[in-house]
């Protein structure tokens, strides 16, 4: 099974009153009893930092990217890894720490004016001259968000779902990511049997809309595991 259970230490830190600060974001003090996480190990030590399984960069922290921990490793086993600092090797922008971007395989500083031109060039080459999609590459930049007023419409390049307008999500399309419609009731969805497997899809579907979940279609229960059809169904 994909679910592994953390050991049963109780939460020791009670939250503060409404609106109060609650410790340092990112600090992991202790874990809840019996919380389920994807992955193959039963985590015995909760005081130590445990890597977070992921399928794409947006699932990770702001200073992380999602990749296999070993070079040429199994694409299905990906975790959030620390971002690469300036002058380190990279393959894409998300690998570089904030304030940097990936140029010719090296993380370089994203000097605003210089960087903006680089990115416009990249997008124009790949997707035509649609400047409303610039925001798709802003995760690892120092560009001001004031430059972008509208959320991406269907087909716009994006990096994460919050780049897209309401009712859309950011999903892979060939080797880029674009805003696609969130799935409606009855639409076919993708249920991943192992976390990270949708890292292999080149036409990724959105998730099911609010109040829906991706489940096996009733009349497909008898089908073999590999051919089961999943659709978005009411909870």
């Amino acid at each position: 099974t994909l679910n592994s259970v953390l050991n049963s230490n109780a939460i020791k830190n009670l939250p503060p009153p409404l609106g109060g600060a609650a410790g340092h974001p990112g600090s992991a003090v202790s874990a809840a009893p019996g919380i389920l996480y994807p992955g193959g190990n039963k985590y015995q030590t909760i005081d130590n930092y445990q890597p977070y399984p992921c399928a794409e960069d947006e699932e990770c922290g702001t200073d992380e990217y999602c990749a296999s921990p070993t070079r040429g490793g199994d694409a299905g086993v990906q975790i959030c890894l620390a971002c690469r600092k300036r002058r380190k090797r990279c393959m894409r922008h998300a690998m570089c720490c904030p304030g940097n971007y990936c140029k010719n395989g090296i993380c370089v500083s994203s000097d605003q004016n210089h960087f903006r031109g680089e990115i416009e060039e990249t997008i124009t080459e790949s997707f035509g001259n649609d400047h409303s999609t610039l925001d798709g590459y802003s995760r690892r930049t120092t560009l001001s968000s004031k430059m972008y007023h509208t959320k991406g419409q269907e087909g716009s390049v994006c990096l994460r779902s919050s780049d897209c307008a309401s009712g859309l999500c950011c999903a892979r399309h060939f080797w880029s990511k674009i805003c696609k419609p969130v799935l409606k009731e009855g639409q076919v969805c993708t249920k991943h049997r192992r976390k990270g497997s949708h890292g292999l899809e080149i036409f990724q579907r959105c998730y099911c809309g609010e109040g829906l979940s991706c489940r096996i279609q009733k009349d497909h229960h008898q089908a073999s595991n590999s051919s089961r059809l999943h659709t978005c169904q009411r909870h």
Epitope: N13, A28, Y37, A82, Y207
Partner: nanobody, 129 residues
């Protein structure tokens, strides 16, 4: 400053369902994880479920897996928790909380209460047998 307001609590018979809502105001919370914690009388506050900033990732406590479903609608700045097949042991005050996307995320991040900067006042859920 983010303010969180829970609604949807109430009394229900065992086996019944409730849907909790958590509405945020003050700033968009699409770069926050949203979670539900609960506290029964005389017990510690415990993690129930969380949904990450990326929308696609949800986490549940063993005790509610398969019965509760967490979701969110960023356009409405609202998170939801559909609770079904409720049991008397689900009786508690349910709190909604928001945690900022951290620099580094670990498996413990979502269930650790000290990571959550903003909390609602809670909504009572009572399940009678």
């Amino acid at each position: 400053e983010v303010q969180l307001v829970e609604s949807g609590g109430g009394s229900v018979q065992a086996g019944g369902s409730l849907r909790l809502s958590c509405t945020a105001s003050g700033r968009p919370f699409d770069n926050y994880a949203v979670a539900w914690f609960r506290q029964a009388p005389g017990k510690e506050r415990e993690f129930v479920a969380a949904i990450s900033w990326s929308l696609s990732r949800t986490h549940y406590a063993n005790s509610v897996e398969g019965r509760f479903t967490i979701s969110r609608d960023n356009a409405k700045n609202t998170a939801f928790m559909q609770m079904s097949s409720l049991k008397p042991e689900d009786t508690a005050v349910y709190y909604c909380a928001a945690a900022p996307r951290p620099k580094r995320v670990s498996v413990q991040y979502f269930s650790t209460s000290s990571n959550y900067d903003y909390w609602g006042q809670g909504t009572q859920v009572t399940v009678s047998s």
